[in-house]
């Protein structure tokens, strides 16, 4: 008799999820010598323990605490780059500017980036058919709770000048409902963070508007100012040139506005 299985609205666990997490962990510890002491099998066991045999709508931050402990890592608090809806460029930037970090440049962020996972209550099975959708099913699902947990802690760790890359091509350049808008903004510590500097990335080559005057950016400025953190904003009119100039800052064309 086939067992009844809950059907969720979201895609199921990424195929070969255990193998992927383990392989990513091994790769990360090989690339980052300061993390070579990490026992990747223990990391996978802690990751698995956070959601296996648990109802996928009833996951808590506490479930991930064993994983958080194993992912302990040094991150220079004044070199943090947050991003919203522009992940690829943010990652391209930190691949060049190696002393800056996005969340996905940390072990925990790297492990989970672009993956989906969930289990089922009272069984040790991973659900590869479907997982809860944040909107249609429930917000306390394994993936959402993981990212909320690590994003909050990443923001809490930040100090001095914190940078955030925002997508100027979106209708809401700053979206209060994004992870940045709903979690990270509210967990920057005013006693540690002096300034939030937004980099608004332009999409069109002929777009010369000052997107720092966008109403949603003004909303972000208001939220940040009320938290006693200074706010500044820069337009990045040519992201391609921006990256090129990060790679080659001595280039003569890099003195002009980008």
């Amino acid at each position: 008799v086939p067992r009844w299985r809950q059907q969720w609205s979201g895609p199921g666990t990424t195929k070969r999820f255990p193998e992927t997490v383990l392989a990513r962990c091994v790769k990360y510890t090989e690339i980052h010598p300061e993390m070579r002491h990490v026992d990747c099998q223990s990391v996978w066991d802690a990751f698995k323990g956070a959601f296996i045999s648990k109802h996928p709508c009833n996951i808590t931050e506490e479930d991930y605490q064993p994983l958080m402990k194993l992912g302990t890592q040094t991150v220079p608090c004044n070199k943090i780059l947050l991003w919203s809806r522009i992940k690829d460029l943010a990652h391209q930037f930190t691949q060049v500017q190696r002393d800056m970090f996005t969340l996905e440049d940390t072990l925990l962020g790297y492990l989970a980036d672009d993956l989906t996972w969930c289990g089922e209550f009272n069984t040790s099975k991973i659900n590869y058919q479907s997982c809860p959708d944040w909107r249609k099913d429930c917000s306390n699902n394994p993936v959402s709770v993981f990212w909320k947990t690590v994003s909050r802690r990443f923001a809490e760790a930040a100090c001095d000048v914190v940078h955030v890359m925002l997508n100027g091509s979106r209708s809401k350049i700053f979206d209060k409902n994004s992870t940045f808008g709903s979690v990270e903004v509210h967990n920057l510590q005013p006693e540690k963070v002096q300034t939030l500097e937004a980099w608004v990335i332009h999409g069109g080559r002929e777009d010369s508007r000052d997107l720092c005057q966008d109403p949603t950016i003004k909303e972000l400025e208001s939220i940040i100012s009320k938290r006693n953190i200074q706010f500044s904003c820069k337009n990045i009119y040519r992201p391609d040139k921006f990256l090129q100039c990060v790679k080659n800052p001595e280039d003569s064309s890099c003195t002009s506005e980008i």
């Epitope: 958080m68 402990k69 992912g71 890592q73 040094t74 991150v75 940390t106 802690r153 809490e156």
Partner: nanobody, 117 residues
């Protein structure tokens, strides 16, 4: 600016005890959870223990549970780590840091604990 100064380390025999202190300044100490982390020679960073801002909630790494006790005195802006039944594998530089991790940027110089006979 967050500043911390760790002290209390030293050379101790296996089975012995030490009490580490961390004097904090530059922030409202009582509002922040605090952690002890350590780095053994040639190894990576290991989280040891954390305590809530009020001091009523604590957590420990499995490797130190039952041997180490974290505490704080908010009136003195000071964090403590009482270490009993010390083992050779506890040898490390111990740092205190704000927050519960997993992301740390330690501001102090740390204090070296050496467990050896």
């Amino acid at each position: 600016e967050v500043q911390v100064l760790e002290s209390g380390g030293g050379l101790v025999q296996p089975g012995g005890s030490l009490r580490l202190s961390c004097a904090a300044s530059g922030f409202t100490f009582s509002r922040y959870a605090m952690s002890w982390v350590r780095q053994a020679p040639g190894k990576g960073l290991e989280w040891v223990s954390a305590i809530s801002g009020s001091g009523d909630s604590t957590d420990y790494a499995d490797s130190v549970k039952g041997r180490f006790t974290i505490s704080r005195d908010n009136s003195k802006n000071t964090l403590y780590l009482q270490m009993n039944s010390l083992r050779a594998e506890d040898t490390a530089v111990y740092y205190c840091a704000d927050g519960t991790g997993p992301f740390f940027d330690y501001r102090g110089q740390g204090t070296l604990v050496t467990v050896s006979s």
